[in-house]
């Protein structure tokens, strides 16, 4: 059975979400990748995507979202800068492989943004800066208007797990017929 997991990130307004989506297989390196939000009862909505083919170490910016695909590490780095409370929600990375359905990469990200800026940075100097420097050369990419009824899922329960522990993985049950290619935690 498919096991769907999510990881919770709790940040303050103005901070930066900086996450990585791990794609296992080298064959996905050049595939176009996208960052999506999943709202209850709705189909995933694509917020930003890499170019097609996806270029190595080449930032793509859409509004406050920056995507960088690092082929050498098998990772898509996603940054959402200057977070707002309204950004709270469930997000996922997917790999576009037309005409096939998109491949979903886990973990899904449960983002919780709260009001008020914390003056004490997190465990890393890059993680919670209020002022974020956008990379000097960024590209906007056109995302496919790809939707599939098979990618609609029931919104998983909200996470109550502790943050930043190995146990902040939540196993979601009753998720059927989700897209079929993963990647590492």
């Amino acid at each position: 059975a498919t096991k769907l997991t999510e990881e919770k990130y709790e940040l303050k307004e103005g901070q930066t979400l900086d996450v990585k989506c791990d794609y296992t297989l080298e064959k996905f390196a050049s595939s176009q990748k996208a960052w999506q939000i999943i709202r209850d009862g709705e189909m995933p909505k694509t917020l930003a995507c890499t170019e097609r083919p996806s270029k190595n170490s080449h930032p793509v910016q859409v509004g406050r979202i920056i995507l960088e695909d690092y082929h050498d590490h098998g990772l898509l780095r996603v940054r959402m800068v200057n977070l707002q409370v309204e950004d709270s929600g469930l997000y996922q990375c997917v790999i576009y492989q037309p005409p096939k359905e998109p491949h979903m990469l886990f973990d899904r990200i449960r983002l919780v943004v709260t009001k008020g800026f914390s003056g004490t940075p997190g465990s890393n100097e890059n993680s919670t800066q209020n002022v974020y420097k956008i990379p000097p050369t960024t590209t906007k990419a056109l995302c496919p208007l790809y939707t599939s009824p098979r990618t609609v899922t029931q919104a998983p329960p909200k996470s109550t797990a502790d943050v930043s522990t190995p146990d902040s993985e939540i196993n979601l049950t009753n998720v059927t017929d989700i897209i079929r290619v993963p990647v590492f935690n």
């Epitope: 890059n126 993680s127 190995p166």
Partner: antibody, heavy 117, light 111 residues
Framework: EVQLVESGGALVKPGGSLRLSCAAS????????IHWVRQAPGKGLEWIGR????????KYSPKVQGRFTISAPTSKNTAYLQMNSLKTEDTAVYYC??????????WGQGTLVTVSS | EIVLTQSPATLSLSPGERATLSCRAS??????????LNWYQQKPGQAPRLLIY???YQKRGIPARFSGSGSGTDFTLTISSLEPEDFAVYYC?????????FGQGTKVEIK
């Protein structure tokens, strides 16, 4: 060329502390994950934990959780393993490793930590 | 945590022979059609080297005589014809769940 170089291994008494360093070159650690793995003399490999240097998020093996702390300031392009309350069973060669698609693809040469009175 | 059990502990073979190494997981390490199971080779005094990832995908630059197979809980590393430099210890490792874990290793020694 991608390279990881560990340092800081030493002889330390039980209950003591030690900080290992892992200097990366040829890539930016903020764009990947860094793992620590150890190997006791004549024994197998044991995964200690992982950090996402960009976000500072860590994962640990339950065996070392609470005693060991991984950090990785991206400005220094170096990862650290802070080891506290060391026990004789922590004696091992400690490796830092770079991540590629759910694997530990490139490894440092290792640094030996000996915990003994 | 997921426990990986490798067998045999030691495999005594001659150069040119076929080596078959087994790795069994205490629970499935496969998801979305991919198995999060990797194989590493380690020679004395050296760091481990990645050979096979996602159960059956050969890392670039690894000789074709190394192959991996399996899914779910049972995995195999095969060395089709042993070369002198292949005598080493082999570890399987899972990346399906935290903590990541290794098998205890299989030593392939010269008969």
């Amino acid at each position: 060329e991608v390279q990881l170089v560990e340092s800081g291994g030493a002889l330390v008494k039980p209950g003591g502390s030690l900080r290992l360093s892992c200097a990366a070159s040829g890539f930016n650690i903020g764009n990947t994950y860094i793992h620590w793995v150890r190997q006791a003399p004549g024994k197998g490999l044991e995964w200690i934990g992982r950090i996402d240097p960009a976000g500072g998020r860590t994962k640990y093996s339950p065996k070392v959780q609470g005693r060991f702390t991984i950090s990785a300031p991206t400005s220094k392009n170096t990862a650290y393993l802070q080891m506290n309350s060391l026990k004789t069973e922590d004696t091992a060669v400690y490796y830092c490793t770079g991540h590629r698609g759910g694997t530990m693809d490139y490894w440092g040469q290792g640094t030996l930590v000996t915990v003994s009175s | 945590e997921i426990v990986l059990t490798q067998s045999p502990a030691t495999l005594s073979l001659s150069p040119g022979e076929r080596a078959t190494l087994s790795c069994r997981a205490s629970q499935s390490v496969s998801n979305y059609g991919i198995s999060f199971l990797n194989w590493y080779q380690q020679k004395p005094g050296q760091a481990p080297r990645l050979l096979i990832y996602a159960a059956s995908y050969q890392k670039r630059g690894i000789p074709a005589r190394f192959s991996g197979s399996g899914s779910g809980t049972d995995f195999t590393l095969t060395i089709s014809s042993l070369e002198p430099e292949d005598f080493a210890v082999y570890y399987c490792q899972q990346s399906s769940n935290f903590p990541w874990t290794f098998g205890q290793g299989t030593k392939v020694e010269i008969k």
